[in-house]
Amino acid sequence: GITNINCSGHIWVEPATIFKMGMNISIYCQAAIKNCQPRKLHFYKNGIKERFQITRINKTTARLWYKNFLEPHASMYCTAECPKHFQETLICGKDISSGYPPDIPDEVTCVIYEYSGNMTCTWNAGKLTYIDTKYVVHVKSLETEEEQQYLTSSYINISTDSLQGGKKYLVWVQAANALGMEESKQLQIHLDDIVIPSAAVISRAETINATVPKTIIYWDSQTTIEKVSCEMRYKATTNQTWNVKEFDTNFTYVQQSEFYLEPNIKYVFQVRCQETGKRYWQPWSSLFFHKTPETVPQVTSKAFQHDTWNSGLTVASISTGHLTSDNRGDIG
Protein backbone atom coordinates (compact mmCIF):
# COMPACT_ATOMS: atom_id res chain seq x y z
CA GLY A 1 0.00 0.00 0.00
CA ILE A 2 0.84 3.67 0.13
CA THR A 3 2.35 3.22 3.57
CA ASN A 4 5.23 1.10 2.21
CA ILE A 5 6.87 3.80 0.10
CA ASN A 6 10.31 5.26 0.89
CA CYS A 7 9.74 8.66 2.43
CA SER A 8 11.67 11.91 2.15
CA GLY A 9 9.89 13.50 5.05
CA HIS A 10 6.65 12.49 6.69
CA ILE A 11 2.87 12.85 6.62
CA TRP A 12 0.54 12.70 9.60
CA VAL A 13 -3.13 13.11 10.36
CA GLU A 14 -4.88 14.94 13.17
CA PRO A 15 -6.75 13.77 15.18
CA ALA A 16 -5.60 10.26 13.98
CA THR A 17 -5.23 8.10 10.87
CA ILE A 18 -8.48 6.37 11.87
CA PHE A 19 -11.16 8.83 12.91
CA LYS A 20 -14.90 9.16 13.28
CA MET A 21 -16.74 9.63 10.01
CA GLY A 22 -17.92 13.20 9.49
CA MET A 23 -15.10 14.80 11.46
CA ASN A 24 -12.97 17.69 10.33
CA ILE A 25 -9.39 16.49 9.85
CA SER A 26 -6.02 17.97 9.06
CA ILE A 27 -3.31 16.24 7.08
CA TYR A 28 0.21 17.58 7.53
CA CYS A 29 3.12 17.06 5.19
CA GLN A 30 6.72 17.87 6.12
CA ALA A 31 9.44 17.60 3.50
CA ALA A 32 12.98 16.48 4.28
CA ILE A 33 14.54 16.33 0.83
CA LYS A 34 18.28 16.86 0.40
CA ASN A 35 19.21 20.02 -1.44
CA CYS A 36 15.58 21.08 -1.82
CA GLN A 37 13.75 24.01 -0.39
CA PRO A 38 10.25 23.17 -1.68
CA ARG A 39 8.72 25.84 -3.85
CA LYS A 40 5.32 24.25 -3.36
CA LEU A 41 3.84 21.25 -1.51
CA HIS A 42 1.05 19.25 -3.13
CA PHE A 43 -1.46 16.79 -1.64
CA TYR A 44 -3.05 13.86 -3.50
CA LYS A 45 -6.06 11.82 -2.44
CA ASN A 46 -6.48 8.50 -4.24
CA GLY A 47 -4.13 9.79 -6.90
CA ILE A 48 -6.02 13.06 -7.54
CA LYS A 49 -4.37 16.39 -6.72
CA GLU A 50 -6.17 18.50 -4.14
CA ARG A 51 -6.64 22.17 -5.10
CA PHE A 52 -8.26 23.77 -2.04
CA GLN A 53 -7.86 24.15 1.72
CA ILE A 54 -4.06 23.84 1.61
CA THR A 55 -2.10 26.10 3.96
CA ARG A 56 1.65 26.54 3.96
CA ILE A 57 2.80 26.48 7.58
CA ASN A 58 6.54 27.04 7.09
CA LYS A 59 9.28 26.38 4.51
CA THR A 60 9.01 22.58 4.81
CA THR A 61 5.47 21.97 6.05
CA ALA A 62 1.94 22.33 4.68
CA ARG A 63 -1.53 21.41 5.92
CA LEU A 64 -4.55 20.08 4.03
CA TRP A 65 -7.88 20.55 5.79
CA TYR A 66 -11.04 18.52 5.18
CA LYS A 67 -14.42 19.42 6.57
CA ASN A 68 -16.93 16.61 7.33
CA PHE A 69 -14.78 13.80 5.91
CA LEU A 70 -17.13 10.95 4.86
CA GLU A 71 -15.00 8.54 2.87
CA PRO A 72 -14.34 5.18 4.59
CA HIS A 73 -10.85 4.85 3.08
CA ALA A 74 -8.45 7.10 1.24
CA SER A 75 -4.81 6.94 0.21
CA MET A 76 -3.03 10.23 0.79
CA TYR A 77 0.41 11.29 -0.36
CA CYS A 78 2.23 14.54 -0.72
CA THR A 79 4.92 15.81 -3.08
CA ALA A 80 7.28 18.76 -3.30
CA GLU A 81 8.24 21.01 -6.19
CA CYS A 82 12.00 21.31 -5.92
CA PRO A 83 13.70 24.21 -7.76
CA LYS A 84 16.14 22.06 -9.76
CA HIS A 85 13.79 19.11 -10.35
CA PHE A 86 11.61 18.82 -13.43
CA GLN A 87 9.13 16.42 -11.74
CA GLU A 88 7.48 16.58 -8.33
CA THR A 89 9.35 14.66 -5.65
CA LEU A 90 7.41 12.23 -3.47
CA ILE A 91 7.60 13.05 0.23
CA CYS A 92 5.43 10.40 1.91
CA GLY A 93 2.06 8.70 1.92
CA LYS A 94 -0.51 7.34 4.36
CA ASP A 95 -3.76 5.37 4.25
CA ILE A 96 -6.52 6.99 6.26
CA SER A 97 -9.83 5.53 7.40
CA SER A 98 -13.04 6.90 8.80
CA GLY A 99 -15.88 5.04 10.46
CA TYR A 100 -17.81 4.58 13.64
CA PRO A 101 -17.27 2.95 17.01
CA PRO A 102 -19.17 -0.33 17.31
CA ASP A 103 -22.72 -0.44 18.57
CA ILE A 104 -23.53 -2.65 21.55
CA PRO A 105 -23.92 -6.16 20.08
CA ASP A 106 -27.45 -7.37 20.74
CA GLU A 107 -29.67 -10.35 19.93
CA VAL A 108 -26.83 -12.71 20.84
CA THR A 109 -28.01 -16.17 19.76
CA CYS A 110 -26.21 -19.50 20.08
CA VAL A 111 -27.55 -22.64 18.42
CA ILE A 112 -26.28 -26.11 17.62
CA TYR A 113 -27.49 -27.24 14.22
CA GLU A 114 -28.00 -30.98 14.49
CA TYR A 115 -25.05 -32.96 13.07
CA SER A 116 -22.83 -29.85 12.92
CA GLY A 117 -20.83 -30.59 16.07
CA ASN A 118 -20.54 -26.82 16.52
CA MET A 119 -22.24 -24.19 18.59
CA THR A 120 -22.88 -21.29 16.22
CA CYS A 121 -23.16 -17.90 17.88
CA THR A 122 -24.43 -14.86 16.02
CA TRP A 123 -25.46 -11.36 17.01
CA ASN A 124 -26.74 -8.12 15.59
CA ALA A 125 -23.64 -5.98 15.16
CA GLY A 126 -25.62 -2.77 14.65
CA LYS A 127 -24.70 -0.11 12.18
CA LEU A 128 -21.82 -0.55 9.75
CA THR A 129 -18.55 0.68 11.26
CA TYR A 130 -16.60 0.92 7.95
CA ILE A 131 -13.38 0.11 9.78
CA ASP A 132 -11.85 -3.15 10.97
CA THR A 133 -13.98 -4.29 13.89
CA LYS A 134 -13.23 -7.43 15.86
CA TYR A 135 -15.54 -9.39 18.11
CA VAL A 136 -14.50 -11.43 21.12
CA VAL A 137 -17.02 -14.09 22.09
CA HIS A 138 -16.75 -14.98 25.77
CA VAL A 139 -18.01 -18.41 26.82
CA LYS A 140 -18.03 -18.99 30.57
CA SER A 141 -18.97 -22.31 32.16
CA LEU A 142 -21.52 -21.95 34.93
CA GLU A 143 -20.24 -25.21 36.41
CA THR A 144 -16.47 -24.69 36.42
CA GLU A 145 -16.31 -20.86 36.11
CA GLU A 146 -13.74 -21.33 33.34
CA GLU A 147 -13.91 -18.81 30.53
CA GLN A 148 -12.87 -19.23 26.91
CA GLN A 149 -12.53 -16.40 24.42
CA TYR A 150 -12.88 -16.60 20.65
CA LEU A 151 -11.80 -13.82 18.31
CA THR A 152 -13.76 -13.32 15.10
CA SER A 153 -14.82 -10.67 12.61
CA SER A 154 -18.42 -11.90 12.29
CA TYR A 155 -20.13 -15.01 13.73
CA ILE A 156 -18.33 -17.90 15.44
CA ASN A 157 -18.48 -21.69 15.25
CA ILE A 158 -17.27 -23.29 18.47
CA SER A 159 -16.67 -27.04 18.41
CA THR A 160 -18.77 -28.77 21.05
CA ASP A 161 -15.68 -30.85 21.84
CA SER A 162 -14.02 -27.70 23.15
CA LEU A 163 -16.90 -26.97 25.55
CA GLN A 164 -15.58 -29.06 28.41
CA GLY A 165 -17.17 -27.19 31.29
CA GLY A 166 -20.49 -28.98 31.29
CA LYS A 167 -23.67 -27.94 29.49
CA LYS A 168 -24.52 -24.57 31.07
CA TYR A 169 -22.73 -21.44 29.88
CA LEU A 170 -22.86 -17.69 29.83
CA VAL A 171 -22.09 -16.17 26.44
CA TRP A 172 -21.44 -12.52 25.70
CA VAL A 173 -19.81 -10.55 22.89
CA GLN A 174 -17.35 -7.67 23.02
CA ALA A 175 -17.01 -5.49 19.94
CA ALA A 176 -13.91 -3.36 19.50
CA ASN A 177 -12.27 -1.17 16.89
CA ALA A 178 -9.92 1.80 16.84
CA LEU A 179 -12.77 4.11 17.84
CA GLY A 180 -14.29 2.26 20.76
CA MET A 181 -15.45 -0.89 22.52
CA GLU A 182 -18.88 -2.18 23.55
CA GLU A 183 -20.14 -5.33 25.28
CA SER A 184 -23.41 -7.24 24.90
CA LYS A 185 -25.68 -8.52 27.62
CA GLN A 186 -24.94 -12.04 28.82
CA LEU A 187 -26.89 -14.92 27.31
CA GLN A 188 -27.40 -18.01 29.48
CA ILE A 189 -27.56 -21.29 27.55
CA HIS A 190 -27.87 -25.02 28.14
CA LEU A 191 -26.39 -27.00 25.26
CA ASP A 192 -29.30 -29.42 25.08
CA ASP A 193 -31.78 -26.55 24.81
CA ILE A 194 -30.24 -24.96 21.73
CA VAL A 195 -30.16 -27.90 19.30
CA ILE A 196 -32.03 -27.21 16.06
CA PRO A 197 -33.20 -30.38 14.29
CA SER A 198 -31.83 -31.44 10.92
CA ALA A 199 -33.63 -29.56 8.14
CA ALA A 200 -37.16 -30.60 7.27
CA VAL A 201 -37.71 -30.90 3.52
CA ILE A 202 -40.90 -31.06 1.46
CA SER A 203 -40.31 -33.76 -1.16
CA ARG A 204 -43.55 -33.91 -3.14
CA ALA A 205 -47.25 -33.13 -3.25
CA GLU A 206 -50.28 -34.73 -4.80
CA THR A 207 -53.92 -33.77 -5.11
CA ILE A 208 -56.37 -36.65 -4.90
CA ASN A 209 -59.52 -36.13 -6.88
CA ALA A 210 -62.03 -37.39 -4.30
CA THR A 211 -65.53 -36.00 -3.63
CA VAL A 212 -63.74 -33.14 -1.94
CA PRO A 213 -60.27 -32.93 -3.54
CA LYS A 214 -57.47 -32.99 -0.99
CA THR A 215 -53.77 -32.22 -1.35
CA ILE A 216 -51.20 -34.34 0.46
CA ILE A 217 -47.79 -32.83 1.19
CA TYR A 218 -44.96 -35.31 1.82
CA TRP A 219 -42.10 -34.11 3.99
CA ASP A 220 -39.29 -35.54 6.08
CA SER A 221 -36.23 -34.85 8.20
CA GLN A 222 -33.18 -36.91 9.14
CA THR A 223 -33.32 -35.76 12.74
CA THR A 224 -32.61 -38.14 15.62
CA ILE A 225 -34.38 -35.84 18.06
CA GLU A 226 -37.31 -37.70 19.58
CA LYS A 227 -39.84 -34.94 20.20
CA VAL A 228 -40.12 -32.49 17.35
CA SER A 229 -42.76 -29.84 16.72
CA CYS A 230 -43.20 -28.47 13.22
CA GLU A 231 -45.12 -25.78 11.42
CA MET A 232 -46.14 -25.84 7.80
CA ARG A 233 -47.18 -22.56 6.25
CA TYR A 234 -48.93 -22.23 2.92
CA LYS A 235 -50.67 -19.64 0.80
CA ALA A 236 -51.85 -18.99 -2.70
CA THR A 237 -48.98 -17.32 -4.56
CA THR A 238 -51.23 -14.31 -5.14
CA ASN A 239 -51.85 -13.85 -1.41
CA GLN A 240 -49.79 -11.94 1.13
CA THR A 241 -50.83 -13.79 4.29
CA TRP A 242 -49.79 -17.30 5.25
CA ASN A 243 -51.92 -20.02 6.78
CA VAL A 244 -50.05 -22.07 9.41
CA LYS A 245 -50.64 -25.68 10.48
CA GLU A 246 -48.89 -27.16 13.52
CA PHE A 247 -47.74 -30.75 13.96
CA ASP A 248 -46.14 -32.91 16.64
CA THR A 249 -43.94 -35.13 14.57
CA ASN A 250 -42.23 -38.51 14.74
CA PHE A 251 -39.77 -38.72 11.87
CA THR A 252 -39.62 -42.50 11.72
CA TYR A 253 -41.97 -42.12 8.75
CA VAL A 254 -42.22 -39.69 5.87
CA GLN A 255 -44.82 -37.19 7.04
CA GLN A 256 -48.06 -36.81 5.08
CA SER A 257 -50.09 -33.68 5.73
CA GLU A 258 -53.52 -33.13 4.21
CA PHE A 259 -54.90 -29.83 2.98
CA TYR A 260 -58.23 -28.92 1.43
CA LEU A 261 -57.38 -26.25 -1.09
CA GLU A 262 -59.14 -24.20 -3.74
CA PRO A 263 -59.04 -25.70 -7.27
CA ASN A 264 -56.86 -24.32 -10.05
CA ILE A 265 -54.69 -22.23 -7.74
CA LYS A 266 -50.91 -22.16 -7.43
CA TYR A 267 -49.88 -22.60 -3.79
CA VAL A 268 -46.55 -22.30 -2.04
CA PHE A 269 -45.58 -24.36 1.04
CA GLN A 270 -42.80 -24.19 3.60
CA VAL A 271 -42.01 -26.16 6.74
CA ARG A 272 -39.85 -25.62 9.80
CA CYS A 273 -39.30 -27.58 13.02
CA GLN A 274 -37.92 -27.24 16.52
CA GLU A 275 -37.25 -29.61 19.36
CA THR A 276 -40.53 -29.60 21.27
CA GLY A 277 -40.60 -26.96 23.99
CA LYS A 278 -37.26 -25.44 23.04
CA ARG A 279 -36.57 -21.88 21.97
CA TYR A 280 -35.15 -21.95 18.47
CA TRP A 281 -36.73 -22.90 15.16
CA GLN A 282 -35.14 -24.04 11.94
CA PRO A 283 -35.20 -21.51 9.13
CA TRP A 284 -38.19 -22.03 6.84
CA SER A 285 -37.52 -24.65 4.18
CA SER A 286 -37.19 -23.87 0.49
CA LEU A 287 -40.34 -22.68 -1.24
CA PHE A 288 -42.35 -25.60 -2.60
CA PHE A 289 -44.93 -24.88 -5.30
CA HIS A 290 -47.98 -26.95 -6.16
CA LYS A 291 -50.89 -26.10 -8.43
CA THR A 292 -54.24 -27.70 -7.65
CA PRO A 293 -56.20 -29.12 -10.61
CA GLU A 294 -59.36 -27.69 -12.05
CA THR A 295 -62.51 -29.31 -10.72
CA VAL A 296 -63.71 -30.30 -14.20
CA PRO A 297 -61.30 -32.81 -15.76
CA GLN A 298 -59.79 -31.67 -19.03
CA VAL A 299 -58.00 -33.61 -21.74
CA THR A 300 -54.66 -31.83 -21.64
CA SER A 301 -51.93 -32.70 -19.14
CA LYS A 302 -48.42 -31.49 -18.50
CA ALA A 303 -45.17 -33.28 -17.74
CA PHE A 304 -44.24 -34.24 -14.19
CA GLN A 305 -42.02 -31.49 -12.86
CA HIS A 306 -41.41 -29.18 -9.91
CA ASP A 307 -44.43 -27.03 -10.64
CA THR A 308 -46.95 -29.09 -12.55
CA TRP A 309 -50.55 -30.14 -12.83
CA ASN A 310 -52.63 -32.57 -14.80
CA SER A 311 -56.23 -33.59 -15.03
CA GLY A 312 -56.17 -37.23 -14.01
CA LEU A 313 -56.96 -38.69 -10.61
CA THR A 314 -53.99 -37.11 -8.93
CA VAL A 315 -51.92 -34.02 -9.44
CA ALA A 316 -48.38 -34.23 -8.18
CA SER A 317 -45.43 -31.93 -7.65
CA ILE A 318 -41.86 -32.72 -6.69
CA SER A 319 -39.34 -30.30 -5.33
CA THR A 320 -36.16 -29.34 -7.10
CA GLY A 321 -35.20 -27.17 -4.16
CA HIS A 322 -33.86 -24.25 -6.14
CA LEU A 323 -35.80 -21.50 -4.47
CA THR A 324 -35.02 -20.40 -0.96
CA SER A 325 -37.12 -18.33 1.33
CA ASP A 326 -36.46 -15.14 3.15
CA ASN A 327 -35.21 -16.52 6.45
CA ARG A 328 -34.94 -13.32 8.42
CA GLY A 329 -36.01 -13.59 12.01
CA ASP A 330 -36.53 -17.33 11.95
CA ILE A 331 -34.14 -18.40 14.66
CA GLY A 332 -35.42 -16.21 17.50
Epitope: I112, E114, Y115, S116, G117, N118, M119, E143, T160, D161, L163, Q164, G165, G166, K167, L191, V195, S198, Q222, T223, T224, I225, E226, N250, F251, T252, Y253
Partner: antibody, heavy 121, light 107 residues
Protein backbone atom coordinates in the same frame (compact mmCIF):
# COMPACT_ATOMS: atom_id res chain seq x y z
CA UNK B 1 -7.43 -35.32 21.00
CA UNK B 2 -10.35 -37.57 21.92
CA UNK B 3 -9.35 -40.88 23.50
CA UNK B 4 -11.04 -43.66 25.46
CA UNK B 5 -9.11 -46.43 27.17
CA UNK B 6 -10.52 -49.50 28.92
CA UNK B 7 -8.64 -51.23 31.71
CA UNK B 8 -9.83 -54.58 32.98
CA UNK B 9 -8.61 -57.77 34.69
CA UNK B 10 -8.23 -59.97 31.60
CA UNK B 11 -9.21 -63.17 33.41
CA UNK B 12 -12.32 -63.65 35.57
CA UNK B 13 -13.41 -66.83 37.34
CA UNK B 14 -16.95 -68.09 36.66
CA UNK B 15 -19.64 -66.57 38.94
CA UNK B 16 -17.27 -63.71 39.85
CA UNK B 17 -17.78 -60.07 38.87
CA UNK B 18 -16.07 -58.04 36.16
CA UNK B 19 -14.97 -54.45 36.70
CA UNK B 20 -13.72 -52.29 33.83
CA UNK B 21 -12.74 -48.63 33.96
CA UNK B 22 -13.00 -46.45 30.87
CA UNK B 23 -10.75 -43.40 31.16
CA UNK B 24 -11.46 -40.63 28.66
CA UNK B 25 -9.55 -37.57 27.54
CA UNK B 26 -10.13 -34.73 25.08
CA UNK B 27 -13.77 -34.24 26.08
CA UNK B 28 -15.94 -33.91 29.16
CA UNK B 29 -18.18 -36.68 30.48
CA UNK B 30 -20.68 -34.00 31.52
CA UNK B 31 -21.42 -33.44 27.82
CA UNK B 32 -21.23 -36.91 26.28
CA UNK B 33 -22.90 -40.28 26.71
CA UNK B 34 -20.77 -43.41 27.08
CA UNK B 35 -22.00 -46.72 25.65
CA UNK B 36 -20.68 -50.20 26.40
CA UNK B 37 -20.53 -52.81 23.65
CA UNK B 38 -18.99 -56.27 23.65
CA UNK B 39 -17.85 -58.66 20.96
CA UNK B 40 -17.60 -62.39 21.64
CA UNK B 41 -14.86 -64.32 19.77
CA UNK B 42 -15.79 -64.61 16.10
CA UNK B 43 -19.15 -62.93 16.78
CA UNK B 44 -20.80 -59.63 16.08
CA UNK B 45 -21.32 -56.58 18.26
CA UNK B 46 -23.70 -56.56 21.23
CA UNK B 47 -24.82 -53.38 22.98
CA UNK B 48 -24.87 -53.70 26.78
CA UNK B 49 -25.77 -50.33 28.23
CA UNK B 50 -25.19 -46.59 28.39
CA UNK B 51 -24.56 -43.90 30.94
CA UNK B 52 -26.03 -40.63 29.72
CA UNK B 53 -24.29 -37.30 30.17
CA UNK B 54 -26.59 -36.44 33.10
CA UNK B 55 -25.72 -39.71 34.89
CA UNK B 56 -28.87 -41.69 34.07
CA UNK B 57 -28.35 -45.25 32.82
CA UNK B 58 -30.06 -47.69 30.48
CA UNK B 59 -29.24 -51.38 30.13
CA UNK B 60 -30.09 -54.17 27.74
CA UNK B 61 -32.96 -56.16 29.26
CA UNK B 62 -30.98 -59.37 29.69
CA UNK B 63 -28.36 -57.56 31.78
CA UNK B 64 -30.48 -55.28 33.99
CA UNK B 65 -30.09 -57.49 37.08
CA UNK B 66 -26.31 -57.92 36.88
CA UNK B 67 -24.95 -54.79 35.18
CA UNK B 68 -24.13 -51.45 36.71
CA UNK B 69 -22.55 -48.41 35.01
CA UNK B 70 -21.42 -45.32 36.92
CA UNK B 71 -18.98 -42.46 36.40
CA UNK B 72 -16.84 -39.81 38.01
CA UNK B 73 -16.95 -36.71 35.81
CA UNK B 74 -14.11 -34.99 37.63
CA UNK B 75 -11.77 -37.96 37.07
CA UNK B 76 -13.03 -38.52 33.50
CA UNK B 77 -13.74 -42.15 34.33
CA UNK B 78 -16.66 -44.47 33.64
CA UNK B 79 -17.04 -47.67 35.63
CA UNK B 80 -18.58 -50.87 34.28
CA UNK B 81 -19.45 -53.69 36.65
CA UNK B 82 -21.04 -57.00 35.65
CA UNK B 83 -21.82 -59.73 38.17
CA UNK B 84 -22.15 -63.52 37.91
CA UNK B 85 -19.98 -64.01 34.83
CA UNK B 86 -20.19 -67.22 32.83
CA UNK B 87 -18.10 -68.64 30.00
CA UNK B 88 -20.34 -67.04 27.37
CA UNK B 89 -19.45 -63.60 28.77
CA UNK B 90 -15.95 -64.08 27.33
CA UNK B 91 -15.55 -61.17 24.94
CA UNK B 92 -13.79 -57.94 24.11
CA UNK B 93 -15.52 -55.13 26.01
CA UNK B 94 -15.55 -51.65 24.48
CA UNK B 95 -16.55 -48.25 25.78
CA UNK B 96 -17.62 -45.77 23.10
CA UNK B 97 -18.60 -42.11 23.03
CA UNK B 98 -21.78 -40.69 21.57
CA UNK B 99 -21.15 -37.27 20.07
CA UNK B 100 -24.80 -36.23 20.06
CA UNK B 101 -24.09 -32.73 18.77
CA UNK B 102 -22.16 -33.99 15.75
CA UNK B 103 -23.73 -37.32 14.83
CA UNK B 104 -27.10 -37.39 16.57
CA UNK B 105 -28.50 -39.70 19.16
CA UNK B 106 -26.67 -42.94 20.09
CA UNK B 107 -24.10 -42.82 17.27
CA UNK B 108 -20.67 -43.87 18.53
CA UNK B 109 -17.92 -41.81 16.98
CA UNK B 110 -14.95 -42.79 19.18
CA UNK B 111 -14.29 -46.23 20.67
CA UNK B 112 -11.73 -47.49 23.12
CA UNK B 113 -9.27 -50.13 21.95
CA UNK B 114 -11.24 -52.74 23.92
CA UNK B 115 -10.25 -54.94 26.81
CA UNK B 116 -10.24 -58.68 26.38
CA UNK B 117 -12.01 -60.62 29.13
CA UNK B 118 -11.84 -64.39 29.49
CA UNK B 119 -14.16 -66.17 31.90
CA UNK B 120 -12.43 -69.35 33.01
CA UNK B 121 -11.46 -71.22 36.13
CA UNK C 1 -36.08 -55.35 20.49
CA UNK C 2 -35.47 -54.13 16.95
CA UNK C 3 -33.82 -56.85 14.87
CA UNK C 4 -31.45 -55.83 12.08
CA UNK C 5 -31.02 -58.43 9.36
CA UNK C 6 -27.83 -57.74 7.46
CA UNK C 7 -27.04 -59.44 4.17
CA UNK C 8 -25.00 -60.97 2.78
CA UNK C 9 -23.08 -62.44 5.72
CA UNK C 10 -20.03 -62.58 3.48
CA UNK C 11 -19.25 -61.35 0.01
CA UNK C 12 -16.33 -61.82 -2.37
CA UNK C 13 -15.31 -59.03 -4.69
CA UNK C 14 -12.32 -57.74 -6.62
CA UNK C 15 -10.34 -54.52 -6.31
CA UNK C 16 -12.08 -51.63 -8.06
CA UNK C 17 -15.49 -53.30 -8.01
CA UNK C 18 -18.59 -51.95 -6.25
CA UNK C 19 -20.40 -53.82 -3.50
CA UNK C 20 -23.69 -53.21 -1.72
CA UNK C 21 -24.73 -54.48 1.70
CA UNK C 22 -28.33 -54.31 2.87
CA UNK C 23 -29.80 -54.00 6.33
CA UNK C 24 -33.49 -54.63 7.08
CA UNK C 25 -35.03 -53.39 10.33
CA UNK C 26 -37.88 -55.32 11.97
CA UNK C 27 -39.75 -52.03 12.48
CA UNK C 28 -39.49 -48.57 11.01
CA UNK C 29 -36.56 -46.54 12.38
CA UNK C 30 -36.63 -43.48 10.12
CA UNK C 31 -33.07 -42.40 9.35
CA UNK C 32 -31.71 -43.62 12.68
CA UNK C 33 -29.12 -46.02 11.32
CA UNK C 34 -25.32 -46.03 11.28
CA UNK C 35 -22.72 -48.17 9.51
CA UNK C 36 -19.39 -49.19 11.05
CA UNK C 37 -16.26 -50.76 9.65
CA UNK C 38 -14.14 -53.09 11.78
CA UNK C 39 -10.63 -54.14 10.89
CA UNK C 40 -9.10 -57.28 12.48
CA UNK C 41 -7.97 -56.64 16.05
CA UNK C 42 -9.33 -53.08 15.99
CA UNK C 43 -12.39 -51.35 17.38
CA UNK C 44 -15.26 -50.38 15.06
CA UNK C 45 -15.05 -47.10 13.15
CA UNK C 46 -18.04 -44.95 12.22
CA UNK C 47 -18.53 -44.57 8.46
CA UNK C 48 -22.14 -43.47 7.93
CA UNK C 49 -24.57 -41.80 10.33
CA UNK C 50 -28.23 -40.79 9.95
CA UNK C 51 -28.52 -43.47 7.22
CA UNK C 52 -26.91 -41.40 4.46
CA UNK C 53 -24.34 -39.00 5.89
CA UNK C 54 -20.61 -39.53 5.69
CA UNK C 55 -18.70 -39.28 8.97
CA UNK C 56 -15.66 -37.00 9.26
CA UNK C 57 -12.59 -38.23 7.40
CA UNK C 58 -14.38 -41.10 5.64
CA UNK C 59 -13.58 -41.47 1.91
CA UNK C 60 -16.40 -40.61 -0.49
CA UNK C 61 -16.38 -44.11 -2.03
CA UNK C 62 -18.52 -45.11 0.97
CA UNK C 63 -22.20 -44.19 0.86
CA UNK C 64 -25.45 -45.02 2.60
CA UNK C 65 -29.07 -44.87 1.50
CA UNK C 66 -32.56 -45.78 2.65
CA UNK C 67 -34.97 -44.94 5.44
CA UNK C 68 -37.76 -46.61 7.35
CA UNK C 69 -36.98 -50.33 7.33
CA UNK C 70 -34.68 -50.87 4.34
CA UNK C 71 -31.13 -49.54 4.21
CA UNK C 72 -28.17 -50.01 1.88
CA UNK C 73 -24.46 -49.42 2.20
CA UNK C 74 -22.26 -49.15 -0.88
CA UNK C 75 -18.51 -49.10 -1.51
CA UNK C 76 -18.07 -47.80 -5.03
CA UNK C 77 -14.49 -48.73 -5.90
CA UNK C 78 -12.97 -51.30 -3.57
CA UNK C 79 -9.49 -50.67 -2.20
CA UNK C 80 -7.32 -53.34 -0.54
CA UNK C 81 -8.03 -51.96 2.95
CA UNK C 82 -11.80 -52.29 2.47
CA UNK C 83 -11.81 -56.09 2.76
CA UNK C 84 -12.92 -56.22 6.40
CA UNK C 85 -16.14 -56.43 8.46
CA UNK C 86 -19.11 -54.04 8.22
CA UNK C 87 -22.00 -53.64 10.67
CA UNK C 88 -25.27 -51.71 10.58
CA UNK C 89 -26.54 -50.28 13.87
CA UNK C 90 -29.95 -48.88 14.83
CA UNK C 91 -30.02 -45.84 17.10
CA UNK C 92 -33.78 -45.54 17.36
CA UNK C 93 -34.61 -47.38 20.55
CA UNK C 94 -33.05 -48.96 23.61
CA UNK C 95 -31.71 -51.60 23.50
CA UNK C 96 -29.55 -50.49 20.62
CA UNK C 97 -28.88 -53.36 18.22
CA UNK C 98 -26.38 -54.24 15.51
CA UNK C 99 -26.73 -56.26 12.35
CA UNK C 100 -24.96 -59.62 12.23
CA UNK C 101 -22.12 -58.17 10.14
CA UNK C 102 -20.82 -58.67 6.62
CA UNK C 103 -17.35 -60.00 5.91
CA UNK C 104 -15.96 -58.58 2.69
CA UNK C 105 -13.38 -60.89 1.10
CA UNK C 106 -11.08 -60.48 -1.85
CA UNK C 107 -11.71 -62.73 -4.84
Amino acid sequence: QVQLKESGPGLVAPSQSLSITCTVSGFSLTNYDIHWVRQSPGKGLEWLGVIWSDGRTDYKGAFISRLSISKDNSKSQVFFKMNSLQADDTAIYYCARNNYYRYGRNTMDYWGQGTSVTVSS
Amino acid sequence: DIVLTQSPASQSASLGESVTITCLASQTIGSWLAWYQQKPGKSPQLLIYAATRLADGVPSRFSGSGSGTKFSFKISSLQAEDFVFYYCHQLYSIPLTFGGGTKLEMK
